[in-house]
Interface confidence: low
């Protein structure tokens, strides 16, 4: 039997992908787990593996479709629950009545690059993966930029208050190499949480013009 | 609604195989664990295995040797095959499936397909 | 491998008769079932988990049971329960049945 106390967490990318962390504190030996959804009003139900990602908690992905499937709606309700095996049957560890837009975290952003670099500024865009078209514009980002000699955790945060996939760094040193992220948010669900930051993109502005000051 | 469709049967030769097909609808494969279950004439009902929605499977200890179930998850369907057979092989093999969970039994059958071994 | 026995193996009742049938597990088991079998037809599930009554399962069957002691009930037998019953273990593979038990009108 497991004892302790289990923590069960999902979100949903707004198409097709039901993302979950379940934790236990408690000894969990070699035991096949997965995690079981079942819309209440739809004709398919689906199943992933648990995987280790610390000594106490395990993840996966359930993948309800094509990657930009609408398979979801406000409407719906999904019933999770992680099933582990116990010898040849399998007990219910944990279970929750998920509602996917009340609990949305999207894709990271994607296709980062640099639209203009000058030797103070830098436009950049990126473009939203597999985002639900009834957010409409209802969306709004984070963006941080990391100086030399910093960490990501020092880079001050600019929000960006609407769905406006690009930004317009000012102020930056010449010659000099920088990293950029940023993330998304819908507007809606009460349990709705930002992406994953983007990979970094890396990009250096020019060198200030020989004789003059910088 | 759920359905599950055996086909494959019929006369066999002693020592021959069989491969019997489940058809599955109205649930998908890699949800559910797809159970073989088989009835001699007259008797009664012996479990044979099982392939998980993971495609692991359980077979009965008596029947590992020569006993083989797969899947097919683009196709929806389940396959049994069982090698050397022999006279008391005859029986209909049924497909089952249990409830939303093991717990709740075999909830869904298919009709069964006879399997005979005979020369 | 658990062998389950059931008793009796067959049995002849007139119908609104109560009629149990008993099976015994020749070690623990956690939870049984009991399904109908109709001639010519695949069993249908009547109980699950000792004595939970399957969807659509009229309420005059039921179960109770624990450890190796089992015991299947139709409170008032109708022309239709004419079948074979058998219970069945989900504690240890491999999973096994009882030899059945056939209830027939007198």
């Known amino acids: 039997a497991v004892n302790g106390t289990s923590r069960f967490t999902c979100f949903y990318n707004s198409r097709a992908n039901i993302s979950c962390v379940w934790s236990q504190d408690g000894a969990l030996q070699d035991t096949s787990c997965q995690v079981h959804a079942w819309p209440d009003r739809r004709r398919w139900n689906q199943t992933c593996e648990l995987l280790p990602v610390s000594q106490a908690s395990w993840a996966c992905n359930l993948i309800l479709g094509t990657p930009d499937s609408q398979k979801l709606t406000a409407v719906d309700i999904v019933t999770l629950r992680v099933m582990c095996r116990e010898g040849v049957r399998w007990r219910m560890m944990a279970i929750q009545d998920f509602k996917p837009f009340e609990n949305l975290r999207l894709m990271a952003p994607i296709s980062l690059q640099v639209v203009h670099v000058e030797t103070h500024r830098c436009n950049i865009s990126w473009k939203i993966s597999q985002a639900s078209h009834y957010f409409e514009r209802h969306l709004e980002f984070e963006a941080r930029t990391l100086s030399p000699g910093h960490t990501w955790e020092e880079a001050p945060l600019m929000t960006l208050k609407q769905k406006q996939e690009w930004i317009c760094l000012e102020t930056l040193t010449p010659d000099t190499q920088y990293e950029f992220q940023v993330r998304v948010k819908p507007l809606q669900g009460e349990f709705t949480t930002w992406s994953p930051w983007s990979q970094p993109l890396a990009f250096r502005t020019k060198p200030a013009a020989l004789g003059k000051d910088t | 609604e759920v359905q599950l469709l055996e086909s494959g049967g019929g006369l066999v030769q002693p020592g021959g195989s069989l491969r019997l097909s489940c058809a599955a609808s109205?649930?998908?494969?890699?949800?559910?664990?797809v159970h073989w279950i088989r009835q001699a004439p007259g008797k009664g009902l012996e479990w044979l295995g099982v392939?998980?929605?993971?495609?692991?499977?359980d077979y009965n200890a008596a029947f590992i040797s020569r006993l083989t179930i797969s899947k097919d998850n683009s196709k929806n369907t389940v396959y049994f095959q069982m090698n050397s057979l022999r006279a008391e092989d005859t029986a209909v093999y049924y497909c089952?499936?249990?409830?939303?969970?093991?717990?709740?039994?075999?909830?869904?059958w298919g009709q069964g397909t006879l399997v005979t071994v005979s020369s | 491998d658990i062998q389950m026995t059931q008793s009796p193996s067959s049995l002849s009742a007139s119908v609104g008769d109560r009629v149990t049938i008993t099976c015994q597990a020749s070690?623990?088991?956690?939870?049984l079932y009991w399904y109908q079998q109709r001639p010519g037809k695949a069993p249908r599930l009547l109980i699950y988990?000792?004595?939970n009554l399957a969807s659509g399962v009229p309420s005059r069957f039921s179960g109770s049971g624990s450890g190796t002691s089992y015991t299947f009930t139709i409170s008032s037998l109708q022309p239709e329960d004419i079948a074979t019953y058998y219970c069945?273990?989900?504690?240890?593979?491999?999973?096994?049945f009882g030899q059945g038990t056939k209830v027939e009108i007198k």
């Open positions: 089952a499936r249990a409830g939303d969970y093991n717990y709740d039994g075999f909830a869904y």
């Open positions: 109205g649930f998908s494969v890699t949800s559910y664990g």
């Open positions: 392939i998980w929605s993971g495609g692991s499977t």
């Open positions: 070690q623990s088991v956690s939870f």
């Open positions: 988990d000792t004595s």
């Open positions: 069945q273990q989900w504690s240890t593979y491999p999973l096994t």
